[in-house]
Interface confidence: low
């Protein structure tokens, strides 16, 4: 809306750089053989590039990116008791961001 | 795997708390009838709940929102040169969150 | 570097109490689950308890349960067993042990031990 | 419970020997299975664990084998330090068993 324009401080772009995002550990990371487990814990945290470039031919992406391993519980119901294993997943966290040129492929003629 | 756990730290988990978020402002946020305009920035940041809770039954969920106008530029393109002009866009954070359970409904029978 | 360190062994009557501490540093504690295994003179090692990170999960050998609890607190990097109702039979040398390896139920650093002995 | 057996109870070997130790579980484990070593007086040293992974820091000489059931812990060639009693245990499910050990002595 154009009015009530008085108590509305000026918007600032969200510039492109890491933020901290929640990545949900899915159970087909760990094991897709078996589907009578769970994982703890559910989610993490990863660093991950985000927010606005200049024009829309750019992109905010990841320039430098580390997997880091994590090890999560892998908790299996074996003869109705919960057996406590361990896994490792590894993440992907984003360590620096760029406003990247999106090349779009010439549709072929 | 059961593997190369040696390196692996134990996954802390992502708890249900407020984050920063990118928001992207769209145009019909703005204006539906015209889309014959640009909005800067194209986007901005966001306080909202994410993570996990203990159990999935219940859902990391805002117990306090308050909502913040902020103003964004319009610009609109009229007989070939930009129009800059101002509108207001109100944004929703999160001032607190909560692990909340979530109410499956009954099916009907 | 890993260090577990016990304390609180020594001789109590049949049907006594004791409390064992283990004391660990150099490494994330409230992360890694933790377990006392003993071992009798001139015997094999046995499993006596296990307590996971946050202290939410604990098991037992069937020995001991009802009458061994074990505990932990994250905040003094602490693990306990508190032994009530005490045998001949739980005469041992105890170890608290760390399981940061591929299950929780397996010990990668161990603590030299204290003995306690049973005996009237 | 399981119950884990290992053999032989001893053995007697010089330096240089490649040594084989076997641990069967009376029900199957998966790959469950860990190798410790104990030396008088000391704590037990993890060796193996899932059944063939090496513990950081163990030498090479050491290995592990087996699934399910029955498990081998193999050590190439016999170095004085070996010289010690090795412990399988299962960490499938509580409650955790050891096998009885086995010592390792000089010929």
């Known amino acids: 809306s154009l009015g009530s324009l008085a108590a509305a401080e000026p918007a600032v772009i969200a510039e492109c750089k890491t933020r901290t995002e929640v990545f949900q550990i899915s159970r087909n990371l760990i094991d897709r053989t078996n589907a009578n487990f769970l994982v703890w814990p559910p989610c993490v945290e990863v660093q991950r590039c985000s927010g606005c470039c200049n024009n829309r031919n750019v992109q905010c992406r990841a320039s430098q990116v580390q997997m880091r391993p994590v090890q999560v519980r892998k908790i299996e119901i074996v003869r109705k008791k919960p057996v406590f294993k361990k896994a490792t997943v590894t993440l992907e966290d984003h360590l620096a961001c760029k406003c990247e040129t999106v090349v779009t492929p010439r549709p072929v003629t | 795997s059961l593997g190369s756990l040696a390196a692996a730290e134990p996954a802390v988990i992502a708890e249900c708390k407020t984050r920063t978020e990118v928001f992207q402002i769209s145009r019909n946020l703005i204006d539906r009838t015209n889309a014959n305009f640009l909005v800067w920035p194209p986007c901005v940041e966001v306080q909202r709940c994410s993570g996990c809770c203990n159990n999935r039954n219940v859902q990391c969920r805002a117990s306090q929102v308050q909502m913040r106008p902020v103003q964004v530029r319009k610009i609109e393109i009229v007989r070939k040169k930009p129009v800059f002009k101002k509108a207001t866009v109100t944004l929703e954070d999160h001032l607190a969150c909560k692990c909340e359970t979530v109410v499956t409904p009954r099916p009907v029978t | 570097e890993v260090q577990l360190v016990e304390s609180g062994g020594g001789l109590v009557q049949p049907g006594g109490s004791l409390r064992l501490s283990c004391a660990a540093s150099?490494?994330?504690?409230?992360?890694?689950?933790m377990s006392w295994v003993r071992q009798a003179p001139g015997k094999g090692l046995e499993w006596v308890s296990t307590?996971?990170?946050?202290?939410?999960?604990?098991s037992y050998a069937d020995s001991v349960k009802g009458r061994f609890t074990i505990s932990r607190d994250n905040s003094k990097n602490t693990l306990y067993l508190q032994m009530n109702s005490l045998r001949a039979e739980d005469t041992a040398v105890y170890s608290c042990?760390?399981?940061?390896?591929?299950?929780?139920?397996?010990?990668?650093?161990w603590g030299q031990g204290t003995l306690v002995t049973v005996s009237s | 419970d399981i119950q884990m057996t290992q053999s032989p109870s001893s053995l007697s070997a010089s330096v240089g020997d490649r040594v084989t130790i076997t641990c069967r579980a009376s029900q199957s484990i998966s790959s469950y299975l860990n190798w410790y070593q104990q030396k008088p007086g000391k704590a037990p040293k993890l060796l193996i664990y899932?059944?063939?992974s090496l513990q950081s820091g163990v030498p090479s000489r050491f290995s592990g084998s087996g699934s399910g059931t029955d498990f081998t812990l193999t050590i190439s060639s016999l170095q004085p330090e070996d010289f010690a009693t090795y412990y399988c245990?299962?960490?499938?499910?509580?409650?955790?068993?050891f096998g009885g050990g086995t010592k390792v002595e000089i010929k």
């Open positions: 042990a760390e399981s940061g390896g591929a299950t929780d139920y397996l010990f990668d650093y």
């Open positions: 899932a059944a063939s």
């Open positions: 307590i996971s990170d946050g202290g939410g999960t604990t």
């Open positions: 150099g490494f994330t504690f409230s992360s890694y689950w």
């Open positions: 245990q299962q960490s499938y499910i509580t409650p955790l068993t």
